[in-house]
């Protein structure tokens, strides 16, 4: 662990209450193929424990979705990954909209610091799939 | 190689016969920019030779495709990446559908073990592009 | 740096003049969360300074876009990432079209050599978003 190989891959636990757009994650071998090795979960949100540059990746699939599902709704469905605490470091890191599609997937490199908590906000009224091969979120430390 | 930096990037060779949804891959410098350094190919399927956590990524583009191509067909076109052997470890790792789109691309972290064979199943009746910049599949060992 | 951990994450600076399909990138902590550690920018294009296998990733979002924006235009909007110089190594590495979608995102492993300059060509007449969480481009050295 001293090499700084912090890494995590999470699966969706549940969505938040109505006014909370955050997705709540879970991880651990007992749950399937998700795991946390270094980072930790704080009430379903991912907290970084080691400074460095990380590869952040995410895939979110909407539940029982067809290409018309996303266009049927007036409010666009958007997924944003960002640092939500500490407040002084709050920023959106990655943002995608579901445009007549049912899945978004992306990745990016970003500097993260010990104590940064990442939030994944799904705006709109569509429910995400909890299937572990359709919706997942992970980080990988790549260098100091 | 003792560092465990197993890595592979493959290009599409061909699709299977009608009842076989698997894509068959090939790799090697003579073919272009694909390569295998550690993992190996077994009849077009990727076999892992070192335990660890891997970043698995894939992009598949449908051949001569427009936004209506995917909606034209009754059966949805879906790509799933999974462990197909040994049977005791069979599981779907990553799944995406082409919803009025012509390309899917995603990536995820997952634990893999020596001997795991990864299959990429394309369901539906649309032919994938063999262009090496449009369709590719790869794995990268990231930590033990 | 001697470990060869070359890495860069760039944000969009501007598009080229009409006959130049290239996107012009910028990076550095003063600009936000973009950075260059090893690779360098040459007139907005990313130049590699160390041989090796790299993970190349990109996300491009079209500005003020809805699902009809991309289908409204006769010429398809396509993003291609390739080596544009030296001319002897010119090749397309990764290509995606916006089919009734507003964002493309993908990644791949590819061998790159010192002096390779990567270009990101956006064909079509739609303007990309400059928001740093919507459009970004990066490379990460992963092994020799």
């Amino acid at each position: 662990e001293s090499l700084g190989w912090d890494i995590a891959e999470l699966q969706l636990n549940h969505t938040g209450p109505q006014q909370d757009p955050r997705l709540y994650w879970q991880g651990g071998p007992a749950l399937g193929r998700s795991f946390l090795r270094g980072p930790e979960l704080d009430k379903g949100q991912l907290r970084i424990r080691r400074d460095g540059i990380y590869m952040v990746h995410i895939q979110v699939t909407l539940a029982i979705c067809s290409s018309t599902s996303t266009s049927r709704h007036h409010h666009p469905t958007t997924l944003a990954v960002g640092i939500c605490s500490p407040a002084s470091r709050s920023i959106s890191l990655l943002r995608l909209s579901f445009h007549q599609g049912c899945t978004i997937a992306s990745q990016r490199l970003t500097p993260l610091a010990r104590g940064d908590t990442l939030c994944t906000n799904l705006t709109g009224t569509l429910l995400p799939s909890r299937n572990t091969d359709e919706t997942f979120f992970g980080v990988q430390w790549v260098r100091p | 190689e003792s560092l465990g930096w197993d890595i592979a990037e493959l290009q599409l060779n061909h699709t299977g016969p009608q009842q076989d949804p698997r894509l068959y891959w090939q790799g090697g410098p003579a073919l272009g920019r694909s390569f295998l350094r550690g993992p190996e190919l077994d009849k077009g399927q990727l076999r892992i030779r070192r335990d660890g956590i891997y970043m698995v990524h894939i992009q598949v583009t449908l051949a001569i495709c427009s936004s209506t191509s995917t909606s034209r067909h009754h059966h949805p076109t879906t790509l799933a990446v999974g462990i197909c052997s040994p049977a005791s470890r069979s599981i779907s790792l990553l799944r995406l559908s082409f919803h009025q789109g012509c390309t899917i691309a995603s990536q995820r972290l997952t634990p893999l073990a020596r001997g795991d064979t990864l299959c990429t199943n394309l369901t539906g009746t649309l032919l994938p592009s063999r262009n090496t910049d449009e369709t590719f599949f790869g794995v990268q060992w990231v930590r033990p | 740096e001697s470990l060869g951990w070359d890495i860069a994450e760039l944000q969009l600076n501007h598009t080229g003049p009409q006959q130049d399909p290239r996107l012009y990138w910028q990076g550095g902590p003063a600009l936000g969360r973009s950075f260059l550690r090893g690779p360098e920018l040459d007139k907005g294009q990313l130049r590699i300074r160390r041989d090796g296998i790299y993970m190349v990733h990109i996300q491009v979002t079209l500005a003020i876009c809805s699902s009809t924006s991309t289908s409204r235009h006769h010429h398809p909007t396509t993003l291609a990432v390739g080596i544009c110089s030296p001319a002897s190594r010119s090749i397309s590495l990764l290509r995606l079209s916006f089919h009734q979608g507003c964002t493309i995102a993908s990644q791949r492993l590819t061998p790159l050599a010192r002096g390779d300059t990567l270009c990101t060509n956006l064909t079509g007449t739609l303007l990309p978003s400059r928001n740093t969480d919507e459009t970004f481009f990066g490379v990460q050295w992963v092994r020799p």
């Epitope: - | 001569i64 909606s71 034209r72 067909h73 009754h74 009746t125 649309l126 262009n131 090496t132 449009e134 | -």
Partner: antibody
Framework: QVQLKQSGPGLVQPSQSLSITCTVS????????VHWVRQSPGKGLEWLGV???????DYNAAFISRLTISKDNSKSQVFFKMNSLQADDTAIYYC??????????????WGQGTSVTVSS | DIVLTQSPASLPVSLGQRATISCRAN??????????MHWYQQKPGQPPKLLIY???NLDSGVPARFSGSGSGTDFTLNIHPVEEEDTATYYC?????????FGAGTKLELK
Amino acid sequence: QVQLKQSGPGLVQPSQSLSITCTVSNFSLSTYGVHWVRQSPGKGLEWLGVIWGGGYTDYNAAFISRLTISKDNSKSQVFFKMNSLQADDTAIYYCARNNYYGNLYAMDYWGQGTSVTVSS
Amino acid sequence: DIVLTQSPASLPVSLGQRATISCRANKSVSASGYSFMHWYQQKPGQPPKLLIYLASNLDSGVPARFSGSGSGTDFTLNIHPVEEEDTATYYCQHSREFPLTFGAGTKLELK
């Protein structure tokens, strides 16, 4: 074995419409597309249009204003209707199944053909 | 529309010899790593029969004496050795874009 059987009139009056039914067996119309092609001594083989598993259609732009292709999956039938026929529409009309790959657009099984003469 | 030009229009061949039929497109029909050219055989009073798809793939049940090659704009159908039952008209067809178009045909006859 896969079969496509066509039924329709042999003689059509000028300016009238042509209707042909293609009844298929041993494959599903919800999976496979069905093309329509005609053949005449003067123009050779001409592709007219196709109806896909999902019910979507693609037409040859030269015929789009007077051609309709539809189907009834439950009856395994595809319907072809062309309006405003003229003498140069005299031809043998074929239905043909799209090859397994939906974006390949090759035709692997054909109906026996319907010989149509446009004449008063 | 893509125009396909077949040559020759008529091809007399002796039994056991090689027959070579050419099909040229006025623009490339190759894309996505494939060549979207197909070949059909038609005998009098019968509908066309698919022989080869994607330039070189034999359809099921087609004898191995049939082979196809080519890419871009130039394609070839070879029959070797020619047998008596191969007397027919052969058509090429592209599927690179709509509308699909066919060549005018090559009539293979025995010398």
